[in-house]
């Protein structure tokens, strides 16, 4: 019988080298054996590239399209084939569907006396258009204190966050993770970075503890 696409391909770009397209088929499908997603840049004399999809659940397929650095005018034609049968034809403009890469190298520095310093790396090289457009959200939570979870919005360019250690409970562990988005490209949020764990050993000076107990 002929195959059918139940949910059309939806694609997002990391605005660097990979776009990811996901779709659902009408029934169980061996995506890599039965389907091919062809893509080609419009407006240029350019190669038609083939993406071999992977399964993403029983009826879901996902394809990772390799591209060179994206520029705003790029537009790709997309053709989904099952053998000789064209199942779906569409187009995709990466600059209008951006999901940034997740920040990396999240590190917690607790050697500053009364401050917890979190640093991470911008996931883009300096010559990428997103490099100077990323802002971040840092999520801090505690497994020891399930009621504690905070989001800190970092709206400046420097990938750092300083938190007074006194705002965290002493003697328990915390976790942090960070994600990014690019305001001027109207992107979705990136995935969260891997989380980093640290132990908050900070104790207020005696005078302050004494002051707190008497007021």
């Amino acid at each position: 019988g002929s195959m059918k696409v139940l949910q059309e391909p939806a694609c997002v770009s990391d605005y660097m080298s990979i776009s990811t397209c996901e779709w659902k088929m009408g029934g169980p499908t061996n995506c890599s054996a039965e389907l091919r997603l062809l893509y080609q840049l419009v407006f240029q004399s350019s190669e038609t590239h083939t993406c071999v999809p992977e399964n993403n659940g029983g009826v879901g397929c996902v394809c990772h399209l390799l591209m060179d650095d994206v520029v705003s005018m790029d537009n790709y034609t997309l053709d989904l084939w099952a053998g000789q049968q064209l199942l779906w034809k569409g187009s995709f403009k990466p600059s209008e569907h951006v999901k940034p890469r997740a920040p990396g190298n999240l590190t917690v520095h607790t050697n500053v006396s009364d401050t917890v310093l979190l640093t991470w790396s911008n996931p883009y090289p300096p010559d990428n258009y997103l490099y100077n457009d990323l802002t971040y959200a840092v999520n801090i939570w505690s497994e020891n204190d399930p009621a504690y979870s905070r989001i800190h919005n970092v709206t400046y360019l420097k990938p750092t966050l300083r938190i007074p250690a006194s705002t965290l409970k002493s003697g328990i562990s915390y976790r942090a993770r960070v994600r990014a988005w690019a305001q001027h490209y109207n992107t979705t949020w990136s995935e969260w970075s891997p989380s980093t764990k640290w132990y908050n050993s900070y104790r207020e000076p005696f005078e302050q503890r004494h002051h707190h107990h008497h007021h």
Epitope: F43, S45, E47, T48, H49, L66, D68, M73, D127
Partner: antibody
Framework: QVQLKQSGPGLVQPSQSLSVTCTVS????????VHWVRQSPGKGLEWLGV???????DYNAAFKSRLSISKDNSKSQVFFKMNSLQADDTAIYYC????????????WGQGTTLTVSS | DIQMTQSPASLSASVGETVTITCRAS??????LAWYQQKQGKSPQLLVY???TLAEGVPSRFSGSGSGTQFSLKINSLQPEDFGSYYC????????FGAGTKLEVK
């Protein structure tokens, strides 16, 4: 490492044809397109055409009627042929690898110097 | 076809100086522009594509900028190996190149 090596004649008579072979190593012709570009003192660099990884071709309209590009993936060879040569076809002819999704050239052959003269 | 006008045609400079080469397209080519370097008797080498993205292995003293019809290639702190010819190329079909800029030692 990636290499493109060209072979072909240096001197051709007017109205004859030029055949150049570009033998590649370090990558597969099933994954990359190969372009042909020529360079002459009078006209500078001119893009002539391309054979894509799937075997389809695109030609510069100015040369389409007398140009053909083909390949043998198993031998890692691309074949360039231009007919009806005239004196103003005297140039250095290059093969070059296509970079990813962009028609720009990240590796070039060493060039084949052609003189068209009787 | 889209015409590419490069300027200057030739340029003399000394090691350590900063130079800028420009390329103008006869119509909008967005960011679809590449720059190549060619040394005497050698094949061209890709420096920049998408107007500003450095190709692999290209030193950071090279930088590309511009979009639409006006583009430039800047070389900071010229090194002895930077002297040669530079070409721009657009890749709105059909591809065409600029006439080149010859960068010579002053």
């Amino acid at each position: 490492q990636v290499q493109l090596k060209q072979s072909g004649p240096g001197l051709v008579q007017p109205s004859q044809s030029l055949s150049v072979t570009c033998t590649v190593s370090g990558f597969s012709l099933t994954n990359y397109g190969v372009h042909w570009v020529r360079q002459s003192p009078g006209k500078g660099l001119e893009w002539l055409g391309v054979i894509w990884s799937g075997g389809s071709t695109d030609y510069n309209a100015a040369f389409k009627s007398r140009l053909s590009i083909s390949k043998d993936n198993s031998k890692s060879q691309v074949f360039f042929k231009m007919n009806s040569l005239q004196a103003d076809d005297t140039a250095i002819y290059y093969c070059a690898r296509n970079k990813g999704t962009r028609p720009v050239f990240d590796y070039w052959g060493q060039g084949t110097t052609l003189t068209v003269s009787s | 076809d889209i015409q590419m006008t490069q300027s200057p045609a030739s340029l003399s400079a000394s090691v350590g100086e900063t130079v800028t080469i420009t390329c103008r397209a006869s119509e909008n080519i967005y960011s679809y522009l590449a720059w190549y370097q060619q040394k005497q008797g050698k094949s061209p080498q890709l420096l920049v594509y998408n107007a500003k993205t450095l190709a692999e292995g290209v030193p950071s003293r090279f930088s590309g900028s511009g979009s639409g019809t006006q583009f430039s290639l800047k070389i900071n702190s010229l090194q002895p190996e930077d002297f040669g010819s530079y070409y721009c190329q657009h890749y709105v079909s059909p591809l065409t190149f600029g006439a080149g800029t010859k960068l010579e030692v002053k």
